[in-house]
Amino acid sequence: MMTGTIETTGNISAEKGGSIILQCHLSSTTAQVTQVNWEQQDQLLAICNADLGWHISPSFKDRVAPGPGLGLTLQSLTVNDTGEYFCIYHTYPDGTYTGRIFLEVLESSVAEHGARFQIP
């Protein structure tokens, strides 16, 4: 019986050209995590294997960095990076748990523009 739950960073936004950390956390289970696959829609970004360590897909090698932890760091973001990301936890004996993150890459940061103006 699968008792675990995946907590994610949920819906997040980041600025074009910047970087973002995608994080998932598996809780409420004693199952052993054997591997975590990170996917963007149907594309594999990276795999973190408990024995073999991190392996980044060749097409993302320049823009994806492993970690922190089982998370994934996306760098040099473009508007095309907007979309759904999935962390797929392979565990024993439970099986597979999947978490979803929606990333929106913005042309510019509203927060940064706002910080330029000070109210006297």
Epitope: Q35, N49, P58, K61, I88, H90, T96
Partner: nanobody, 117 residues
């Protein structure tokens, strides 16, 4: 399922060389990386080296860097471990492992490497 068969182990003098091979068969399309591990008597299994199947990205344990080289022949679905400047502490059973997209590693039966002083 993925089957792994190791070969090339044996007895070698300290300072000598050996080349281990690991042939994969079965559902090899499911493999994204392969690696070598070793287990010495009375010790836990430890990582030695790995190589990604999609490119030539390699990783090594600090204890073997500069002495061991992992390589792959994708056409033959075979991974190799060239071991040079062998030391007594390299004595162990060496296991091949295949990391699979489906989440579970496949393991070989192991090949014994003994380095005599």
């Amino acid at each position: 399922e993925v089957q792994l068969v190791e070969s090339g182990g044996g007895l070698v003098q300290a300072g000598g060389s050996l080349r281990l091979s690991c042939a994969a068969s079965g559902s090899t399309f499911d493999i994204y990386a392969m690696g070598w591990f070793r287990q010495a008597p009375g010790k836990e299994r430890e990582f030695v080296a790995s190589i990604s199947s999609g490119d030539t990205n390699t990783n090594y344990a600090d204890s073997v860097k500069g002495r061991f080289t992992i390589s792959a022949d994708n056409a033959k679905n075979t991974v190799y471990l060239q071991m040079n400047s062998l030391k007594h502490e390299d004595t162990a059973v060496y296991y091949c492992a295949a990391g699979r997209y489906s989440g579970y590693n496949s393991w070989g039966q192991g090949t014994q490497v003994t380095v005599s002083s």
